[in-house]
Amino acid sequence: EEELQVIQPDKSVSVAAGESAILHCTVTSLIPVGPIQWFRGAGPARELIYNQKEGHFPRVTTVSESTKRENMDFSISISNITPADAGTYYCVKFRKGSPDTEFKSGAGTELSVRAKPSAPVVSGPAARATPQHTVSFTCESHGFSPRDITLKWFKNGNELSDFQTNVDPVGESVSYSIHSTAKVVLTREDVHSQVICEVAHVTLQGDPLRGTANLSETIRVPPTLEVTQQPVRAENQVNVTCQVRKFYPQRLQLTWLENGNVSRTETASTVTENKDGTYNWMSWLLVNVSAHRDDVKLTCQVEHDGQPAVSKSHDLKVSAHPKEQGSNTAAENTGSNERNIY
């Protein structure tokens, strides 16, 4: 017949990180005489958690709750629980001697720690990409426990399906990390778009954590160019405009060439913003046609966001205009804007 029983009534206990864990243990007899000690883990490598007689255990306090006649309470409370405290805790009765010898152990209580995941961090590609290209976004969150976690991707509120997620490590651990990569096809309308990574975990009580990335940091929408010749502004002067439309980001440099020769270079400044977040800009050039004997090829060349230049040309017929010797080939423009100048 059993002379003494060490009863650990809780097979498992789950505690949120930062809280206290109460580990219950009752013993049915003081005989054989000897101390009760608490350990984490079993075998020779087990870790002493509490021994009342000696040692310093600042996070452990004793919790005597039982007033029952038939047993004595040797429960403990461990404060400020972290994921590193997870494991199986054993209440062990020793028999007094020289040295004390282990007499009987409780069945153990598995302590699992509920730790919140860190705020998801979403990162996009290092370089910008243009519409119709597929880009990858990564989402990372760390330090959560237990391992079960749900991660979803959204683009502008619409759930994405093309992603791969890994939770590490695969085996048992005090805490876990999640890494997910989603593929997103860019469209010209994505300047204002957001990609959202949403993480749901038992510790979050139904209020998932979200990380966001703005596609404005990822997308490059190349401009469309249109060069048009306006009605004659004054005798011997022609106004040529270059409409630069639907570009993003704003960084843009425009160069006018007359028959292949640089006439003027300017940087987009006073732009107008479209509803979709892209920009429009217009530059104009006043050409003194009397200075040209032959037709003039005018080219609007645009370098957008460090990309190779794109250009649009316009042939200016000068045969109908009287020639004037000695005049400038191009008058200084007085501004770059979207107002048509007549």
């Epitope: 003081l30 005989i31 306090t61 004793t62 006649r69 429960s75």
Partner: antibody
Amino acid sequence: EVQLVESGGGLVKPGGSLRLSCAASGFTFSSYVMSWVRQTPGKGLEWVATISSGGTYTYYPSSVKGRFTLSRDNAKNSLYLQMNSLRAEDTAVYYCASSLTGSSFDYWGQGTTVTVSS
Amino acid sequence: DIVLTQSPASLAVSLGERATISCRASESVDLYGTSFMHWYQQKPGQPPKLLIYRASNLESGVPDRFSGSGSRTDFTLTINPLQAEDVATYYCHQSSDELPWTFGGGTKVEIK
């Protein structure tokens, strides 16, 4: 009703021996830690010996260790204290006491008197 | 050995009044927050009877005018209100895991 009845006390000369018995009834004897406690007018109550419920473990204070031996027979619901090399200071009323947890002495017998005198 | 000192040695209290007995241990008798201090009542010609176990738990069948309190080294048995049948000698007893287990010297309670 729990009953503990001691017997075996009497007058003995110093250096002599006595065997005290305690007959238990009214409870599951084999589940209880059993002890002897003695009382003298001069020294009050003094713990003498304790035995575990299965009889494996016995404990004594230094004042009687090596002279007294505690045993039990769970089949007979009986507790025994063999007292050897008795001294005058062993003179006392000897109580048999039961303890469910080995902590407090829950029930006591009426006691048996041991007198050690020449 | 853990020495238990009871005070006073004797106490005379009027019927219906409070009787308070103190027991001081030479070192702590607490194990994991449980105080292994017990109180017994002994009437003349009778064996001791358990009143309070583990400092504050009332033994079954004991009237609730008896109460125990204290921890570590300082303990108190209170009888309130005192009744005529409470005339007896009261003993404290410690059973921590340090042998030997010991008793206090006793406090004799009488009616004033």
